[in-house]
């Protein structure tokens, strides 16, 4: 039987009566366009919804758009579309909803063909009020709020121009011409490449890179001959042309651009692209393309400088630049990332590393299911997940693999058991560990969503016909019950729960059809009457992470330390509550060389943990760039991963030599930095 | 193989406080919980409370909740239960059991390595 | 805490006989159930874990079945040393056994 239909499910007592209770529905007499949906803030109960309408007439387009806002998690909504005095919304800029709880919304309003500049409405209310203000400019991408302070914006224009807001775009001032691409960086920073001849795309490779500090009074160019850069954790990326060729190569630099080094990676050809696939403070995943049109790569691992790099991961999945790659970071446990990757055969197979991209191995078969058609041999496969590029190639696929930091070691995704990826329907899968252990959660594809902090997982089928019917867990997908939420069917367009997981509110979204109208309808569920009581101490158990051997010493040792977490039992039904913090125990673990990454010019043989020297450069001394000089390293071989945290045991000796021997592309060296003044 | 050894028997007054110990010899102790069970003469199997001796997380059951405190030493490999306020109820068998472990859930695998008992007796 | 109600209180049997035991617990507490055997004077001994999981060690006439609220442990043939009490312990909350169930000689 599929799950939750065994007799060993305990049911939640009288949950129809509770949810009936606990069901709103909302109605919008719009034409049926595009809905989005945005939350202001957080623990706010504040929605922003915008239904738009096109209809392409001969020599123009008729638009309309509604502002609906909810209070309440979606509850009610009022219509506040007069607010922005009936204006057309242009939805390829969204909603622009400020950093943390600044209460900031910004909403680019289309404007006639001959106006001097673009239009927005800000509010800094939760979206009580609005203001209208005609910019200067025609923007070309969405208002950019500074992370640290959201008074500050930053937008681009269709000219190309950097303009900057320090009072919340009430006034606007273009710092730049012939900007390409602007981020901001950390401390009110801004980065963003410059173009000298023609345009963006014809000065590709001969980009200049220039950083201010204080919004535009003053400027530094950081580097030229750029490509492109991005800012991943404490790391500023910069892909740099070579001299001679039309090779580029990466270059990092750690305190904001003053210095730069030359990562060790493959350099790369015109056709191929580097990719930041995930960054924290402590290292960085990198993708770097393969040569031809593969449709793979490498995945590279970091130092904590982000110079060294180790090879993780080969024939990485990564269809083009921009294109589709399935690098997941599960963040329900640290550690864990879950990608494809392209075998020989051309199948498509997913691999997970469990620490930080050591190592990587296919996914544990789940209990009691059977392998695919695409099994050689029927006793032996593995969980393959649909992650985007089974998305963008238009599987049955509604969603990407979903986990959340405060519902430890959940991870829900569709998948298919075999060899590899299938294109047949595929099945939801669920893992309490963090994706040690799998068990098929639902038959066929679903939507799905975690409240509460895990206490709560609500699931819709997908499916082309009307739907009526969700489903909901309250012990981590091993039993459901199901609830009717209107007796008129709809036909779905989304799911919506509050980001971060600890609602206990969702949104169902869809159109209702009838011979000669069609409405946009929302049903806001609140499950809070299904978790009647607060969780107590004797509703969590403790659990060890990453355990997979109790008789090892180090038994869930994991970049250096093992960590206990207070975990929810799957047979208590309590709210964890909005204010729920993850309770965990760390213990340090003793070194070992599974703590040290391979240093520059070594190399792990396969199922092997020493680091052996790289053939090519045995006899040879090592050097290598760093801040733009040439180091002589005197390893063994090893350097500590970083974010490791053990202490004691294996203890590698390593030692780095300064050359003062220049060696990076000079265009980066400080030398020829210049400072600039407006 | 792993053994469990309990310290011997003790004969206490109403009032007073008992410390049994348990030391675990073969094994990683500090990987596994330890639970104590006790049981009265005639009577059945009572949880009191568990600890993980690495990191010294501890969990008693309701009724014992204040009066029982479980520690455990991970540098000897020994667990300790003491019990305070004694009164004659309390006269029993007292076992130190591990819980068995198949993943990373401490207590949900049933309790494979015991004690050999430690007699308790509160009589004025 | 969850209440654990085995049946029956006591039980009389013959050496070759087949003895079923059965666990009651007051909510779901999924398959998180042991079963143990315990002889006079000596601790208890760890027969089956999550519900059907026999210990390594116990012989395979132990056999254990049922999972949510509904549990029985079941000796397909009776020997001489399998007379004795036993408990069922459930896991999924603060630790609760059952009452026990002693199999006597007929």
């Known amino acids: 039987s599929a799950p939750g239909e065994d007799e060993e499910c305990g049911r939640v007592r009288d949950f129809v009566a509770k949810l009936a209770n606990n069901t709103h529905q909302h109605v919008a007499d719009d034409l049926r366009g595009s809905v989005s949906l945005s939350w202001v803030g957080d623990s706010t109960g504040v929605i922003l919804v915008l239904t738009t309408f096109h209809v392409p007439l001969v020599i123009m387009t008729f638009g309309q758009s509604k502002l609906y806002r909810s209070e309440d998690y979606g509850k009610n909504f009022k219509d506040i579309t007069d607010l922005i005095n009936n204006t057309f919304i242009r939805t390829e800029f969204g909603m622009a909803i400020g950093p943390e709880n600044s209460g900031k919304v910004v909403l680019t309003a289309e404007v006639s063909g001959g106006s001097r500049g673009g239009r927005i409405f800000r509010s800094s209310d939760f979206a009580k009020n609005f203001v209208q203000t005609d910019l200067p400019f025609h923007p070309l991408t969405q208002m950019m709020y500074s992370p640290q302070n959201s008074d500050y914006l930053l937008a681009l224009s269709t000219e190309n121009g950097l303009w900057v807001s320090k009072n919340f775009g009430g006034k606007w001032e273009e710092i730049h011409k012939a900007v390409c691409l602007a981020k901001w960086g950390s401390d009110n920073t801004i980065f963003f490449t410059t173009y000298a001849n023609g345009s963006c795309k014809a000065d590709l490779g001969a980009l200049e890179l220039w950083r201010t500090s204080d919004l535009g009074k003053s400027f530094k160019t950081i580097g030229v001959k750029i490509y492109s850069f991005g800012l991943g954790g404490r790391f500023l990326f910069a892909s740099v042309m070579a001299d001679k060729d039309t090779t580029r190569r990466i270059h990092v630099s750690t305190d904001q651009g003053d210095t730069w080094s030359m990562a060790q990676l493959p350099s790369v050809g015109q056709e191929q692209f580097y990719s930041i696939l995930a960054a924290n403070d402590d290292m960085v995943f990198m993708h770097v393309d393969e040569p031809g049109d593969t449709g793979f790569g490498t995945i590279f691992t970091s130092d904590d400088r982000g110079i060294v790099y180790s090879k993780s991961l080969d024939r990485h999945l990564y269809t083009t630049t921009g294109g589709e790659t399935d690098f997941t970071n599960v963040t329900s446990l640290r550690g864990v990332y879950i990608t494809s990757v392209l075998s020989e055969d051309n199948s498509i197979q997913t691999m997970i590393t469990f620490d930080q991209g050591g190592r990587w191995t296919h996914l544990r078969k789940p209990e009691n299911s059977e392998c695919d058609a695409t099994a050689k041999n029927k006793n032996e496969c593995s969980l393959h997940i649909h992650a985007s590029y089974s998305i963008s190639q238009k599987l049955n696929v509604p969603m990407a693999p979903l986990s959340e930091p405060n519902a430890v070691g959940i991870v829900i995704a569709h998948g298919s058991v075999g060899d590899a990826i299938s294109v047949m329907v595929p099945d939801v899968y669920i893992s309490d560990d963090g994706g040690y252990s799998w068990t098929k959660m639902l038959e066929g594809p679903h939507y799905y969503t975690i409240l509460d902090s895990g206490g709560i997982i609500v699931a819709i089928e997908h499916s082309s016909r009307p739907i009526n019917v969700i489903k909901f867990s309250t012990d981590e997908g091993q039993c459901w019950q199901t609830y009717t939420f209107t007796r008129d069917p709809i036909y779905f367009t989304g799911l919506a729960s509050e980001p971060g997981a600890r609602s206990m509110n969702i949104s169902i979204w869809g159109f209702t059809e009838s011979f000669l109208t069609s409405q946009w309808v929302s049903y806001t569920i609140d499950f809070k009457d299904i978790l009647e009581r607060n969780c107590e101490e004797k509703d969590y158990t403790i659990w060890l992470a990453h355990s997979t051997d109790p008789e090892d010493y180090e038994d869930g040792c994991i970049l250096g330390y093992k960590e206990q977490f207070l975990r929810l039992r799957k047979s208590s039904v309590c709210q964890n509550g909005r204010d729920y913090v993850v309770t965990k125990q760390p213990s340090i673990c003793l070194c070992s060389l599974e703590d040290f990454l391979c240093d520059f010019g070594y190399y792990r043989p396969e199922n092997d943990s020493k680091c052996v020297e790289q053939p090519e450069l045995k006899g040879h001394d090592l050097e290598f760039c760093l801040y733009g000089r040439e180091e002589h390293l005197t390893t063994n071989g090893y350097r500590k991963i970083p974010g490791d945290k053990c202490q004691g045991g294996v203890n590698p000796v390593r030692e780095v030599k300064d050359l003062k021997k220049k060696c990076t592309s000079n265009f980066l060296s400080p030398e020829k930095q210049n400072s600039k003044s407006n | 193989q792993v053994q469990l050894v309990q310290s011997g028997a003790e004969v206490k007054k109403p009032g007073s406080s008992v410390k049994v110990s348990c030391k675990a010899s073969?094994?990683?102790?500090?990987?596994?919980?330890i639970s104590w069970v006790r049981q009265a003469p005639g009577q059945g199997l009572e949880w009191m409370g568990g600890i993980i001796p690495i990191g010294g997380w501890a969990n008693y059951a309701q009724k014992f909740q204040g009066r029982v405190t479980i520690t455990a030493d991970e540098s000897t490999s020994t667990a300790y239960m003491e019990l305070s306020s004694l009164r004659s109820e309390d006269t029993a068998v007292y076992y130190c059991?591990?819980?068995?472990?198949?993943?990373?859930?401490?207590?949900?695998?049933?309790?494979?390595?015991w004690g050999q008992g430690t007699t308790v007796t509160v009589s004025s | 805490d969850i209440q654990m109600t085995q049946s029956p209180s006591t039980l009389s049997a013959s050496v070759g006989d087949r003895v079923t035991i059965t666990c009651r617990a007051s909510?779901?507490?999924?398959?998180?159930l042991a079963w143990y055997q315990q002889k006079p004077g000596k601790a208890p001994k760890l027969l089956i874990y999550?519900?059907?999981s026999l210990e390594s060690g116990v012989p395979s006439r132990f056999s254990g079945s049922g999972s949510g609220t509904e549990f029985t442990l079941t000796i397909s043939s009776l020997q001489p040393d399998d007379f004795a009490t036993y408990y069922c312990q459930q896991a999924d909350g603060h630790i609760t056994f059952g009452g026990g169930t002693k199999v006597e000689i007929k």
């Open positions: 059991a591990r819980q068995g472990r198949k993943t990373g859930y401490y207590y949900y695998y049933g309790m494979d390595v």
């Open positions: 909510q779901s507490i999924s398959s998180w």
């Open positions: 999550k519900a059907s």
């Open positions: 073969g094994g990683t102790f500090r990987n596994y919980a």
